[in-house]
Structures are given as C-alpha cells and as structure tokens.
C-alpha cells in the first residue's frame, strides 16, 4: 500500500536557490513522518531530511554538500535549497516514510525532478575599435 508523490518534472534555476515541492496522496498530519530529498538516478545522496508530526514543525538537516530548509502542510513537503552550483544539476527524488503510529508506509518512487542550475555568464560589453 504505497503513497503517490507528485513532483514537477523540471526546474530551471537562474539564481542559486530553488524550492521543490513534493505533493503526497496522504495527510501528513495524521502520522509521524520522515521526509527526505535524494539526488541522483539511484538516489545515492540524501540531500535533505526532516522529521515531523502533527504537533511540531520538523527540523530539516542537510548533507554537508548542500544547504537546505523545509516546510510542510497537510499534503505537501517543500524543500528549499540554496548556494547551488552548476554541478548540482541532477535528478532529485522526494521520499516520505510514515513511522508512527503503525503501519509503516512509504511512497512509490516518482519520476523525479530534474533541477538544472544555469551557469552564470558575466557579460562584458566590448567597445569595438573605430575604423
């Protein structure tokens, strides 16, 4: 019995920060949960994680390579990442696990969100020499 998650397929980032929303087919306020964001095709890197329940706002903590924070309402967890660089361009997957009360529930793997960090180009206006 798996929970479904909806993510935007693509986020193109001009600045160095992004908000990624994970919308779940389950009421987050019903149970104690652990929400996380993973990077890579094989979800190798746990980017950000937060534990929460109906009585307290979760504390989000990030992998050393990332800066993150998060928020949630009754059906959506939003991860905010900042200080992003071009090499952070990758596919990101939302994951949620509901631990207490039982039974344990988690989500079906989604198609993920490709976060594309655009390289910043400094424009130099060159004055062309007069002929």
């Amino acid at each position: 019995n798996k929970i479904l998650v909806k993510q935007s397929p693509l986020l193109v980032v001009d600045s160095n920060e992004v908000s990624l929303s994970c919308r779940y087919s389950y009421n987050l306020l019903a149970k104690e949960f652990r929400a996380s964001l993973y990077k890579g095709v094989n979800s190798d890197v746990e980017v950000c994680v937060g534990n929460g329940n109906f009585t307290y706002q979760p504390q989000f903590r990030s992998n050393a390579e990332f800066n993150c924070d998060g928020d949630f309402d009754n059906e959506t967890v939003t991860f905010r990442l900042w200080n992003l660089h071009v090499n952070h361009t990758d596919i990101y997957f939302c994951k949620i696990e509901f631990m207490y009360p039982p039974p344990y529930l988690d989500n079906e793997r989604s198609n993920g969100t490709i976060i594309h960090i655009k390289e910043k180009h400094l424009c130099h206006t060159q004055s062309s020499p007069k002929l």
């Epitope: 104690e32 207490y100 009360p101 039982p102 039974p103 344990y104």
Partner: antibody, heavy 120, light 111 residues
Framework: EVQLVESGGGLVQPGGSLRLSCAAS??????????VGWIRQAPGKGLEWIGE???????YYSPSLKSRVTISRDNSKNTLYLQLNSLRAEDTAVYYC????????????WGQGTLVTVSS | DIQLTQSPSSLSASVGDRVTITCRAS??????????LHWYQQKPGKAPKLLIY???SLQSGVPSRFSGSGSGTDFTLTISSLQPEDFATYYC?????????FGQGTKVEIK
C-alpha cells in the same frame, strides 16, 4: 528460519564505546516489511527500547540515548550494528536485537542477547 | 512518552489457576481501531517471547490458554489455566508512539 545472533559484548571501561553486531538470517534487512530494533535489560530490571532501523536505512532512537547511540547495518553481510559511546555503569545490560513487522511493530523474533558490563 | 503501568508487580499462583495481569497506558494506544499493545513472556536468562500482538491476537505457536483483551488505555493478559512452564515475567509494550515503551513487568511465581 528467522534467526538473530548478537555478538560483541564483554567488559568495557567507563567512558569507552561499544559496537555490537546482530547477524540476521532467514530474512533480509533491506527488504520491505520488517525492521530491526535494539532493546536492553539491566540486571534484574525491565526492558528498555534503544532504537530501530527500517529497511530503507532510516533510524529512530530513544530520546534519552539519542546523543550517544548509532544504529547502522551492512546489507552485504545482512548484519545490524549498535554503537554506544561515553559508556557509564548504568549501561551495563543484556543487549538484544529483535525483528518487528511493519503492520503492528511487534517484536516477533529476538536474539539470545549479549551482556555488556561497564566497569573499571 | 507513553507510560505503561502493569499490575500487580508480582503474584503467586498455583498450577491450574486463572491469572490476570493488567496494563494501563498513560494515553490511548489505538489508531484506526487497532490497539498497538503487545504482550511478552520472559524466563530467567532467556530473551522475551511474543505472546499477544495488537492487544488480542495470539502469536503463532502460543498456547490458547493465553489471551489478551482491552483497547484505548486499559489492557489485560489472561492465562486461563496456569501451567508449570508459565512461571515467568510478563511485559506489555506499546508501539503506537516513539519512543516505544514497556511496562515494568509482572513476575508470576509459584505459590
């Protein structure tokens, strides 16, 4: 047949660390449906839950021990580990690993336990 | 944390007696009609053994003289006719909330 076998107990100095192992057979630690917890029992006392690990690798710890405990696993060996730091006399206990099902979280299979004595 | 209080702490009984142990939770351990309260038996020097899960379901291989009842905050373990091998310590445990907690135990001794 499901089996859990703990090892690594013995005499430890106060302030030291312990690393206990729990070798699982008859089921996979990384397959959905079950998780494994650690429970301890001080001599002549009741049972105390330490923490647990889910098939995903997610962990939950007792708030009273959270700052000193780490539960991890090695999927290739199908083995679970308990690391407990800054040991004190009150940590002297028999340490059990036990499997739980995801529907009720009841501990249906237990290891035989391993005794840890913290003393100088 | 959810506190579980068992009573009595110890009791003396004879073979064939009906024995009742109670477990009271500091808050309800029910969710969607299921009580996340379990009972274990422990003999000296041995690991605990699951007897009853979800308040009233008998674990496979456990004799039918063991039964559990209750919901919400009040639960009972009953041994209908005590056998010599039943002299042990019995614990209740809740899995409704983290941290999981156990009752302090009830020791069943021979009269």
């Amino acid at each position: 047949e499901v089996q859990l076998v703990e090892s690594g107990g013995g005499l430890v100095q106060p302030g030291g660390s312990l690393r206990l192992s729990c070798a699982a057979s008859g089921f996979s630690l990384s397959t959905g449906g079950v998780g494994v917890g650690w429970i301890r029992q001080a001599p002549g006392k009741g049972l105390e839950w330490i923490g647990e690990i889910y098939h995903s690798g997610s962990t939950y710890y007792s708030p009273s021990l959270k700052s000193r405990v780490t539960i991890s696993r090695d999927n290739s060996k199908n083995t679970l580990y308990l690391q407990l730091n800054s040991l004190r006399a009150e940590d002297t206990a028999v340490y059990y690993c036990a499997r739980y099902g995801y529907y009720y979280y009841d501990f249906d299979y237990w290891g035989q336990g391993t005794l840890v004595t913290v003393s100088s | 944390d959810i506190q579980l209080t068992q009573s009595p702490s110890s009791l003396s009984a004879s073979v064939g007696d009906r024995v009742t142990i109670t477990c009271r939770a500091s808050q309800s351990v029910d969710f969607h009609g299921i009580s996340f309260l379990h009972w274990y038996q422990q003999k000296p020097g041995k690991a605990p053994k699951l007897l009853i899960y979800a308040a009233s379901s008998l674990q496979s291989g456990v004799p039918s003289r063991f039964s559990g009842s209750g919901s919400g905050t009040d639960f009972t373990l009953t041994i209908s006719s005590l056998q010599p091998e039943d002299f042990a310590t019995y614990y209740c445990q809740q899995s409704y909330r983290s941290p999981r907690t156990f009752g302090q135990g009830t020791k069943v001794e021979i009269k």
